[in-house]
């Protein structure tokens, strides 16, 4: 058993049929010595008396808010949560496996630039009685500071019969140099509590590996005289690291109709303009990627050909 | 600790081309190592990230773009003195700071060159003959060093009398390649910045 926060404790249980469970001793936070009784949750049934209560925690029915009273007055609470371990593996029931970029990916993180700011998000089908708390650091043995905000519900989607909820959090490394060469990864730890179930999820990454620029901005077309070719120009996104001559991007320019199966014109360039062939009912799209370290491409910025 | 804006004339920067070749060569070599050594811990997640130039050179700090010198987190640099002549300095107006930066890059390359050559000598003794260093990568390191044209003492190639542990050598190769790729990215960014300035 360990303390998650004040008056909230996590009991780690090997979860299998007829498991013996864990013996837990609760102590009432009071100078009083006698006349103390214990109850669980909203029940008025007295579970025991005395300053300490010893319980055998085997299942979710044994978890919850234990309260010690004296003469009708509440003295203190202890909330017990369960953390299940099945076949040596901690449960991951609360969050959905996003399976990208690999299986068992519960947390996904992205950074728009090298400033040390990044966003992580996760998915769940659970809508109520759900709380998250996020901690982060650079390295684990001698951790350097990363400050994370509160996790918030950022999107709701319908997936078949189920609703899916996306939560996200923004974090900022306390003293980040955009030009630094990372040797210690960022660690992100998410504590998830659903009702009386506790789970924790972690992710470890270098900022350089989670870079995904914003799409290029200010796309403009200029038809070339006596030609079917069009000059398309754009600018670096405002959120990208500066100076741009140091933090350079490379671009992919594509002309395609509405369907992905349609034929297309595609060209890669390090410049902020390119010449492509425009077709009726097609769109010109441009996306960006770090020129020197190939992490993710940005989303597409698009303009219609006509 | 920073690069000034007044640097060589546009298009007069012979090192840019060589640095692009360097990044390409080390990326290809790393990809080859990952494929060939698929049953070894050779991915970014699996290896320890070591920097053989740590406390010996200060490339990131010495080559910091002027715009980032206002960022206090970028300024915890180690002061190191370097030789200040080089043929990539295509303008006489080039400052002492830029010479410091380019000479730091030269020292990086020299250190990695020695490590890679020592390692290759060991890998050539491996009866499995599983992986060797790409001669192209070694040549590209040499070309960039020549373009930088700094005079410095030759670092002797390390020779070892004991029987090499090939498993450890291959893991060390992965660690070195990952670190060198990261440094090659920095070098490419620096050369691009200098070329544009």
């Amino acid at each position: 058993i360990w303390e998650l926060k004040k008056d909230v404790y996590v009991v780690e249980l090997d979860w299998y049929p007829d498991a013996p469970g864990e013996m837990v001793v609760l102590t009432c936070d009071t100078p009083e010595e006698d006349g103390i009784t214990w109850t669980l949750d909203q029940s008025s049934e007295v579970l025991g008396s005395g300053k300490t209560l010893t319980i055998q925690v085997k299942e979710f029915g044994d978890a919850g808010q234990y309260t010690c009273h004296k003469g009708g007055e509440v003295l203190s609470h202890s909330l017990l949560l369960l953390h299940k371990k099945e076949d040596g593996i901690w449960s991951t029931d609360i969050l959905k496996d996003q399976k990208e970029p690999k299986n068992k990916t519960f947390l996904r993180c992205e950074a728009k630039n090298y400033s040390g700011r990044f966003t992580c998000w996760w998915l769940t089908t659970i809508s109520t009685d759900l709380t998250f708390s996020v901690k982060s650091s650079r390295g684990s043995s001698d951790p350097q500071g990363v400050t994370c905000g509160a996790a918030t519900l950022s999107a709701e989607r319908v997936r078949g019969d189920n609703k899916e909820y996306e939560y996200s959090v923004e974090c900022q490394e306390d003293s980040a140099c955009p030009a630094a060469e990372e040797s210690l990864p960022i660690e992100v730890m998410v504590d998830a509590v659903h009702k009386l179930k506790y789970e924790n999820y972690t992710s470890s990454f270098f900022i350089r590996d989670i870079i995904k620029p914003d799409p290029p901005k200010n796309l403009q077309l200029k038809p070339l005289k006596n030609s079917r070719q069009v000059e398309v120009s754009w600018e670096y996104p405002d959120t990208w690291s500066t100076p741009h001559s140091y933090f350079s991007l490379t671009f992919c320019v594509q002309v395609q109709g509405k369907s992905k199966r349609e034929k297309k014109d595609r060209v890669f360039t390090d410049k902020t303009s390119a010449t492509v062939i425009c077709r009726k009912n097609a769109s010109i799209s441009v996306r960006a990627q770090d020129r020197y370290y190939s992490s993710s491409w940005s989303e597409w910025a698009s303009v219609p050909c006509s | 600790r920073n690069l000034p804006v007044a640097t060589p004339d546009p298009g007069m920067f012979p090192c840019l081309h060589h640095s692009q070749n360097l990044l390409r060569a080390v990326s290809n070599m790393l990809q080859k190592a990952r494929q060939t050594l698929e049953f070894y811990p050779c991915t970014s997640e699996e290896i320890d990230h070591e920097d053989i130039t740590k406390d010996k050179t200060s490339t990131v700090e010495a080559c910091l773009p002027l715009e980032l010198t206002k960022n206090e987190s970028c300024l915890n640099s180690r002061e190191t003195s370097f030789i200040t002549n080089g043929s990539c300095l295509a303008s006489r107006k080039t400052s002492f700071m830029m010479a410091l930066c380019l000479s730091s890059i030269y020292e990086d390359l020299k250190m990695y060159q020695v490590e890679f050559k020592t390692m290759n000598a060991k890998l050539l003794m491996d009866p499995k003959r599983q992986i060797f260093l790409d001669q192209n990568m070694l040549a590209v390191i040499d070309e960039l060093m020549q373009a930088l044209n700094f005079n410095s003492e030759t670092v002797p190639q390390k020779s070892s009398l004991e029987e090499p542990d090939f498993y450890k050598t291959k893991i060390k190769l992965c660690i070195l390649l990952h670190a060198f790729r990261i440094r090659a990215v920095t070098i490419d960014r620096v050369m691009s910045y200098l070329n544009a300035s």
């Epitope: 070719q229 034929k263 014109d265 360039t269 062939i277 | -």
Partner: antibody, heavy 118, light 107 residues
Framework: QVQLVQSGAEVKKPGASVKVSCKAS????????LHWVRQAPGQGLEWMGW????????EYAPKFQGRVTMTTDTSTSTAYMELRSLRSDDTAVYYC???????????WGQGTMVTVSS | EIVMTQSPATLSVSPGERATLSCRAS??????LHWYQQKPGQAPRLLIY???QSISGIPARFFGSGSGTEFTLTISSLQSEDFAVYYC?????????FGGGTKVEIK
Amino acid sequence: QVQLVQSGAEVKKPGASVKVSCKASGYTLTDYYLHWVRQAPGQGLEWMGWIDPENGDTEYAPKFQGRVTMTTDTSTSTAYMELRSLRSDDTAVYYCNANKELRYFDVWGQGTMVTVSS
Amino acid sequence: EIVMTQSPATLSVSPGERATLSCRASQSISINLHWYQQKPGQAPRLLIYFASQSISGIPARFFGSGSGTEFTLTISSLQSEDFAVYYCQQSNSFPLTFGGGTKVEIK
């Protein structure tokens, strides 16, 4: 699968014209760009131009501008390349090729040998 | 127009050995570079597109790399069926242009 079958070999006199055909099967002609590339005996490859069968748009290499015409007949799934004012150095194998991407060549025809000789 | 230069013109290699073919562009073409293989009496066949992207059905021993002005096609271990002429082609701008080819022959 996608296939391109070209017309047979031709022998032409200098100053004449030649029209090479290229019949597509295994796909809808309008779904792909169509290019023509030639190869003189023992020489390398030379791009001549492309046509978009969907709308008839064409782009020719400057070297062939004014001397080449590329057309398609969607009813027969056939593309044509006509080269006029033939010279002896136009002797080559002419290939048609198709791709969903405009700028490189995925599916090639078997080639048509055109000999220009007096 | 962009001029593509391939080297060497002829490469003599023993089966099982590694072959490295070079292609240089007269100006920067990013990764807009494609490789083809042509055997005598046959049409060319696409091997690699956009400098390093593999084509399904093409053996993994064919490996493309490079960007800007310098590109390489590496055949890690030459098989008898790999002896052929290899062409690079740029798609950065029209007119599309090919290199002069590298003939890979048996040593």
